[in-house]
C-alpha cells in the first residue's frame, strides 16, 4: 500500500508483458492515468492499453520484451501525481504455464516433460495425487523433465504442472505460473477424470 491508499501490483508475464494494476479506494469513480518510461532522462509516455474495472481504469499493460531495467511510472488523477515509483520489473516475473506437457510411463514410474522456457533460474514443479491422497504430492526439477517413482499402476492419478522462478535468482516478489490443465492417468492411459479424493469419515457423536 502507499501513503495515499493506492495499492499497486506489478506482474511481468513471461518476460514479455508488464501489468501494473492499482486499487484506488481513495479515488472512487476516477479515471487515473498511467505514465511510464524505462529511462530516467526520458519523457513519460502514457499507457495505451488500460485495464478497466467497472468502467474505470485499474491498470496498464506494457510491452517489455526481455527487459531487466527499471520501470519508472507515475499514476495521476488528472495532472496531479497520485503515486510515483520505480521498480526493477525483472523481480516481478510470472513465467508462462508449461506447454506441450507429455507423460512417459515405465512400470511404476512416469516422466513428465514439457518445453523448457527460454530463460534460466526456473523450477518445473509437477504435482500428483490419487483418490487416496487428501493432498497433492510434489516434485520439482531445474528442467522440465520430472520423474515420479513408486506409483501404483492400478491407481488413477491426477497430474498438474507449473513453473516457478527460483528465489535465489529472482528474489521474493515473483509469482508461480498458472497450473497446467489437470490430466488423469491409470495403467499408463489417459482418463477423463479420477474419483474425487476421499475425505476421512467424520466421527459419529454418541448420544
Amino acid at each position: 500500500a502507499t501513503g495515499e491508499g493506492l495499492q499497486i501490483q506489478i506482474i511481468y508475464f513471461n518476460l514479455e508483458t508488464v501489468q501494473v494494476t492499482w486499487n484506488a479506494s481513495h479515488y472512487p469513480r476516477s479515471n487515473l492515468s498511467f505514465h511510464y518510461k524505462f529511462s530516467r532522462d526520458e519523457a513519460y509516455d502514457q499507457c495505451t492499453v488500460y485495464i478497466l474495472q467497472e468502467g474505470h481504469t485499474s491498470g496498464c499493460l506494457l510491452d517489455a520484451e526481455q527487459q531487466d531495467d527499471i520501470l519508472y511510472f507515475s499514476i495521476r488523477n488528472g495532472t496531479h501525481p497520485v503515486f510515483t515509483a520505480s521498480r526493477w520489473i525483472f523481480y516481478y516475473l510470472k513465467p508462462s504455464s508449461p506447454k506441450q506437457v507429455s507423460f512417459s510411463w515405465h512400470q511404476d514410474a512416469v516422466t513428465v516433460t514439457c518445453s523448457d522456457l527460454s530463460y534460466r533460474g526456473l523450477l518445473y514443479e509437477v504435482q500428483y495425487r490419487s483418490p487416496f491422497d487428501t493432498e497433492w504430492q510434489s516434485k520439482q526439477e531445474n528442467t522440465c523433465n520430472v520423474t515420479i517413482e513408486d506409483l501404483d499402476a492400478e491407481k488413477c492419478y491426477a497430474f498438474r504442472a507449473r513453473v516457478k522462478a527460483m528465489e535465489d535468482a529472482y528474489g521474493p516478489d515473483t509469482y508461480p505460473s498458472d497450473w497446467s490443465e489437470v490430466t488423469c492417468w491409470q495403467r499408463g492411459e489417459t482418463r477423463d477424470s479420477c474419483p474425487e479424493p476421499r475425505t476421512p469419515p467424520k466421527p459419529k457423536l454418541s448420544k
Epitope: 530516467r40 531487466d68 531495467d69 527499471i70 515509483a85 526493477w88 534460466r120 535465489d168 535468482a169
Partner: antibody, heavy 118, light 107 residues
C-alpha cells in the same frame, strides 16, 4: 551464503583513474541487479550507481555521471566500477551491494577505500 | 530526488532502554523503506525492508513501522551490541536516497 568482496581501492591523484572489482558468490549473480554505494570519511551513505542483471541497464548519481562506468562480467560473477577524472570529493569507502527486489539492498561487501589526493 | 530526514541525529541511551528513531521522506514512498545498522569500520547491515519486514537473521528486538512519508525504527531493549549508527533509505523511486544517520551512543 552470499559473499561480496571488493578490491581495487587505493591512493590516486586528482584526475586519475581506478577500477574497482567486486567478486560475488552464494547467489545467482546474473539475475541480480547490483549497486555501488560510497561513504566519505565520517559521513553518511550515498548511492553511486546501479546495473541490471544483464548489464544492459546502467544508472548513475548526477555527481559521477560521465566519469564513472558500472559494468559486470556475469560468467565471472564480478561487478566493476571504472572511475575516471577522479576528484578529492570522490574519496570514500566504496561498497558493492546486492539488490533484493522488495528486500532492497540486502547484502553488502566489506568495502574498499579510495583516496584521491595529491 | 527524495530527501530523507532522520531524527534525532544522535541519542544517548542505556542498556535495556527502548529506543525509537524516526525517518521522514519528502514525498510518498509507499512502504519502500529500509533500515541499516553500521558499526565503526564495518559495512552497513540490512535490518528491515518494506518498512516493517525483518531481514533474515535479524533479532526481533528490531521493529519498523510506517507508510507513506513517516517511519520509525524501534529497538525494544537496547543491548551493548546495538550501539551503532542507523540509516534509513528509500528505494521507492530512483535514485535511492539515505537519511543522514542516527548515532546511538552509550549513556
Amino acid at each position: 551464503e552470499v559473499q561480496l568482496l571488493e578490491s581495487g581501492g587505493g591512493l590516486v591523484q586528482p584526475g586519475g583513474s581506478l577500477r574497482l572489482s567486486c567478486a560475488a558468490s552464494g547467489f545467482t549473480f546474473r539475475s541480480s541487479a547490483m549497486h555501488w554505494v560510497r561513504q566519505a570519511p565520517g559521513k553518511g551513505l550515498k548511492w553511486v550507481s546501479s546495473v541490471s542483471g544483464s548489464g544492459a541497464g546502467t544508472y548513475y548519481a548526477d555527481s559521477v555521471k560521465g566519469r564513472f562506468t558500472i559494468s559486470r562480467d556475469n560468467p565471472k560473477n564480478t561487478l566493476y566500477l571504472q572511475m575516471n577524472s577522479l576528484r578529492a570529493e570522490d574519496t570514500a569507502v566504496y561498497y558493492c551491494v546486492k539488490e533484493g527486489g522488495s528486500r532492497g539492498f540486502d547484502y553488502w561487501g566489506q568495502g574498499t577505500l579510495v583516496t584521491v589526493s595529491s | 530526488d527524495i530527501q530523507m530526514t532522520q531524527s534525532p541525529s544522535s541519542l544517548s541511551a542505556s542498556v535495556g532502554d527502548r529506543v525509537t528513531i524516526t525517518c521522514r521522506a519528502s514525498q510518498d514512498i509507499s512502504n519502500y523503506l529500509a533500515w541499516f545498522q553500521q558499526k565503526p569500520g564495518k559495512a552497513p547491515k540490512s535490518l528491515i525492508y518494506t518498512a516493517s519486514s525483518l531481514q533474515s537473521g535479524v533479532p526481533s528486538k528490531f521493529s519498523g513501522s510506517g507508510s507513506g512519508t513517516d517511519f520509525t525504527l524501534t529497538i525494544s531493549s537496547l543491548q551493548p551490541e546495538d550501539f551503532a549508527t542507523y540509516y534509513c533509505q528509500q528505494y521507492n523511486l530512483y535514485p535511492p536516497t539515505f537519511g543522514q544517520g542516527t548515532k546511538v551512543e552509550i549513556k
